[in-house]
């Protein structure tokens, strides 16, 4: 039997009778949040053999071992993945071992196994036989291995029982649990699966089979199932189903969508067969079942059942997120916020029709109205008194409309109407009737030219730079001196820059009244000497990174209610040079044969320019007479050697560890203090996992489908 | 012993401002979701916020979302409700209680409130 | 949201009385429901979680059963402790909501 489209068992173990008849699980399988600490003993799901998902176990109290409860699963398919994990073993408080011993392969994804207070058989698991890249497995906070004492079938005897292999430089034996090896497939079977007594599966299968050579005795397909056979691709006619199976157009017209009653039914696209069209798609006509390429952004029409919509905050804002088409008004009141124009943006930033009228009042958190970064029509079916179809009223901060030079905005009904904005120029104002079509529609008053602007220097004379000098982290860069009429008016410069990866960025992004910025800031004083050009050293900058910079002058804006002039340069794109990588990262070496070796490595964090090439340097190294000095049959004479695994838990290190001892008079050693990037690493490391826990605590208490 | 405490209540003016603190004892304060929970006179529970163990998610009831803000801090042991814009219906008794470890939203340890 | 109705809001009861208090949701909630006592001038207290499962150091005469959308809270034999205003609680999904409360005085 196919179950799904997801399993969730929570808060009563008796919900695992569920899984009586699954053979398969198409979707997930979580098992969390169970308090009563039951014998499982008597719960045993032999059918169960592959997972299209991930498995999330999470607060079981007394499950020990998951090898009785699925002795055969197989295969973890990964096919959609839990913050990247296909397995996920999270704060299991008895569990000893994971003993899955049947596990042959974990198609995608990766695993995370943390906070297990009492599991151990971590180690003598080899993961690199289940999954194709364990480097960004996650295993940590479990119990230390030296109290593990982990133990493989028959090395107490001397008989050992278990194959071996290297991790991390320890050839050992690779077992799940203290009676269960962890199966291998000959090394004649390359990477097919393989039967119970070591004859090669087809290659279609996965995991394993139950006969050699044939592609119908297969416990799990490498690509797709189609009436008992695993195959390459679907036959014609037949669809690509949830990653794992082939099915017919009836099938997939008939599925009822987990998600919600109400939606339109499944789509077939690209020969899969899916809930939704994908990214860039949408639906040929509400009831069909294919999909077609979106003109630009796929439209989202989202509607007010009050007409008026009120963005207030950050949380009202996020209703329209993904919205193309807002079918009613905008009201944006928006006096307070952190981070509120790109938080806006990021919600509101897709709209591009507005039906009705849009107001912006006492929004005095706003510095500009970019964060509309796709408005290209405003309606204005329904109108505020007065026909004003476009109203701005009291926005102390308020200095930019858009950016008129890269946007068509059309009003296509009613009035703009203007008032209170102390920080906007009226010239702004008369571009924005120009570029919206709406110049001759608004009567005297509607654009008041006495109290917007009227503190703001709004005749901008243009500062040009003079020169500029790069390094590899930092950039000379000097003006001409700016001489308004009145030398007095002007009290010194302001210098922003940011990093600017592409050349599109303008004065207001990111930018709010409330403090954020994604700009930088340096204050630079007038020169004493008249006759010398203002410059400014910028320094701590990234090598080989383009940055944005520009330059304001500072001037008293006000001299007896005339408006005075202003002056700013244009941006400026400037990159420093380039510079020494860092260090290539995950630099992994293996022997396959006698005489080669095979290296590889992942490019560094940070290229600091165009990298044309790598060099690799070896040498040999004499024979360590270390190796020869043991009697490596016998298990308690074998010399502990410590490999650093790369992880530190935090919360578990409480002193400082003893080192060595210095001898003379001079004691213990305490250890080396961090480096820097240490350091850094450790923080990462602790945000990381606060990230996760986030991710888990947030997936797992959420509103249920009803 | 297991152990919530409240502080912070008190007399304020409609649209101002109070913080409430829950100092907790007794448990690993890091492991568990909180809750705030509030009682007018003379009236039945009401859930107000709730905080889940890692401290990255946080919900709502819809009478006080966007007014109010639950936050922890692990190293002190405490959680907080920050309350903006209060309302004349906000008055009540705010109690804290901690959510069960297996049982998400059953609240198993209460503080003894604050006014 | 899911609304949750106690029924009765108040009874009268003697000691050694049989106690039967119910609670309906608005839609199902599985067995995602809580019961609490409250006595006046004090912090609720967990009886039941899980429909049907005693917290700890919650006396035997207090049962809970029901799933979906219909629960009960039995007393089997009022004691003196035991008068007090009782509430059930879903958390099946988010908003969290109680029921308006069943008062239990003694007759």
């Known amino acids: 039997e196919i179950c799904g489209p997801g399993i969730d068992i929570r808060n009563d173990y008796q919900q695992l009778k569920r899984l009586e008849n699954c053979t398969v699980i198409e979707g997930y399988l979580h098992i969390l949040l169970i308090s009563k600490a039951e014998d499982y003993r008597s719960y045993r799901f032999p059918k169960l053999t592959v997972i299209t998902e991930y498995l999330l176990l999470f607060r079981v109290a007394g499950l020990e071992s998951l090898g009785d409860l699925f002795p055969n699963l197989t295969v973890i398919r990964g096919w959609k993945l839990f913050y990247n994990y296909a397995l996920v073993i999270f704060e299991m408080t008895n569990l000893k071992d994971i003993g899955l011993y049947n596990l042959r392969n974990i198609t995608r994804g990766a695993i995370r196994i943390e906070k297990n207070a009492d599991l151990c058989y971590l180690s003598t698991v080899d993961w690199s036989l289940i999954l194709d890249a364990v480097s960004n497995n996650y295993i940590v906070g479990n119990k230390p291995p030296k109290e593990c004492g982990d133990l493989c079938p028959g090395t107490m005897e001397e008989k050992p029982m278990c194959e071996k292999t290297t991790i991390n430089n320890e050839y050992n034996y690779r077992c799940w649990t203290t009676n269960r090896c962890q199966k291998m497939c000959p090394s004649t079977c390359g990477k097919r699966a393989c039967t119970e007594n070591n004859e090669c599966c087809h290659p279609e299968c996965l995991g394993s089979c139950s006969a050699p050579d044939n592609d119908t005795a297969c416990v799990a397909c490498r690509h797709y199932y189609y009436a008992g056979v695993c195959v390459p691709a679907c036959p014609p006619n037949t669809y690509r189903f949830e990653g794992w199976r082939c099915v017919d157009r009836d099938f997939c017209a008939n599925i009822l969508s987990a998600e919600s009653s109400d939606s339109e039914g499944f789509v077939i696209h690209d020969g899969e067969c899916m809930q939704e069209c994908p990214s860039g798609f949408i639906r040929n006509g509400s009831q069909s079942m294919y999909c077609i390429p979106c003109e630009g952004p796929c439209p989202k029409v989202c509607e007010e059942e009050k007409k008026t919509k009120t963005i207030d905050s950050v949380t009202s804002a996020q209703m329209l997120q993904g919205c193309t088409i807002f079918k009613g008004n905008l009201l944006i009141n928006i006096r307070r916020g952190n981070n509120i124009a790109s938080e806006l943006e990021n919600f509101m930033g897709l709209i591009e029709v507005v039906t009705g009228y849009v107001k912006i009042r006492h929004s005095h958190a706003l510095v500009s109205l970019s964060f509309l970064k796709n408005l290209r029509l405003i309606l204005g079916e329904e109108q505020l008194e007065g026909n004003y179809s476009f109203y701005v009223l009291d926005n102390q901060n308020l200095q930019q409309l858009w950016d008129w030079d890269h946007r068509n905005l059309t009003i296509k009904a009613g009035k703009m109407y203007f008032a209170f904005n102390p920080k906007l120029c009226v010239s702004e104002i008369y571009r924005m009737e120009e570029v919206t079509g709406t110049k001759g529609r608004q009567s005297k008053g509607d654009i008041n030219t006495r109290n917007n602007g009227e503190r703001a220097s709004c005749e901008s004379d243009v500062l040009h730079f003079t020169s500029t000098t790069t390094s590899k982290n930092r950039i000379i860069i000097t003006w001409h001196r700016y001489r308004p009429p009145d030398y007095r008016d002007l009290i010194s410069f302001t210098v922003y820059y940011k990093e600017a990866p592409f050349k599109n960025v303008t004065e207001y992004d990111g930018q709010d009244a409330c403090g954020s910025n994604s700009w930088n800031m340096v204050d630079v004083d007038l020169p004493p000497n008249k006759d010398v050009e203002p410059g400014i050293l910028l320094h701590g900058l990234k090598p080989w990174t383009q940055y944005a910079v520009y330059v304001k002058a500072v001037t008293l804006t006000m001299v007896e209610n005339d408006h005075i002039r202003g002056a700013k340069s244009e941006i400026l794109y400037i990159r420093t040079n380039a510079s020494v990588p860092s260090i290539p990262l995950d630099v992994l070496s293996a022997s396959n044969s006698s005489s080669q070796l095979i290296v590889k490595w992942n490019p560094p964090s940070l290229p600091n320019g165009n990298l044309s090439y790598y060099i690799v340097r070896w040498q040999r190294q004499p024979q360590d007479g270390y190796l020869y000095r043991h009697n490596y049959c016998s298990k308690d004479k074998i010399p502990i050697r410590k490999y650093a695994d790369g992880t530190i838990d935090i919360e578990e290190v409480t002193e400082n560890p003893k080192t060595e001892v210095c001898g003379g008079e001079k004691g213990p050693c305490c250890a080396c203090p961090k480096t820097e990037a240490e350091k850094q690493a450790e923080k990462e490391e602790a945000e990381y996992r606060k990230v996760f826990e986030n991710f888990l605590h947030n997936s797992i208490f959420v509103p249920r489908p009803e | 012993e297991v152990q919530l405490v409240e502080s912070g209540g008190g007399l304020v003016q409609p649209g101002g401002s109070l913080r409430l603190s829950c100092a907790a004892s007794g448990f690993t304060f890091s492991s568990y979701a909180m809750s705030w929970v509030r009682q007018a006179p003379g009236k039945g529970l009401e859930w107000v916020s709730r905080?889940?163990?890692?401290?990255?998610?946080?919900y709502y009831a819809d009478s006080v979302k966007g007014r109010f803000t639950i936050s922890a801090d692990t190293s002190k042991n405490t959680a907080y409700l920050q309350m903006n814009s209060l309302r004349a219906e906000d008055t009540a008794v705010y109690y804290c209680?901690?959510?069960?470890?297996?049982?998400?939203?059953?609240?198993?340890?209460w503080g003894q409130g604050t006014l | 949201d899911i609304q949750m109705t106690q029924s009765p809001s108040s009874l009268s009861a003697s000691v050694g009385d049989r106690v039967t208090i119910t609670c309906r949701a608005s839609?199902?909630?599985?067995?995602?429901l809580a019961w609490y006592q409250q006595k006046p001038g004090k912090a609720p207290k967990l009886l039941i979680y899980?429909?049907?499962s005693r917290a700890s150091g919650v006396p035997s005469r207090f049962s809970g059963s029901g799933s979906g959308t219909d629960f009960t809270l039995t007393i089997s034999s009022l004691q003196p402790e035991d008068f007090a205003t009782y509430y059930c609680?879903?958390?099946?999904?988010?908003?969290?909501?109680f029921g308006q409360g069943t008062k239990v005085e003694i007759k």
């Open positions: 609680q879903q958390y099946y999904s988010s908003p969290l909501t």
């Open positions: 899980g429909a049907s």
């Open positions: 839609q199902s909630i599985s067995s995602y």
């Open positions: 209680a901690r959510e069960s470890y297996y049982e998400w939203g059953a609240m198993d340890v």
């Open positions: 905080i889940s163990p890692s401290g990255g998610s946080t």
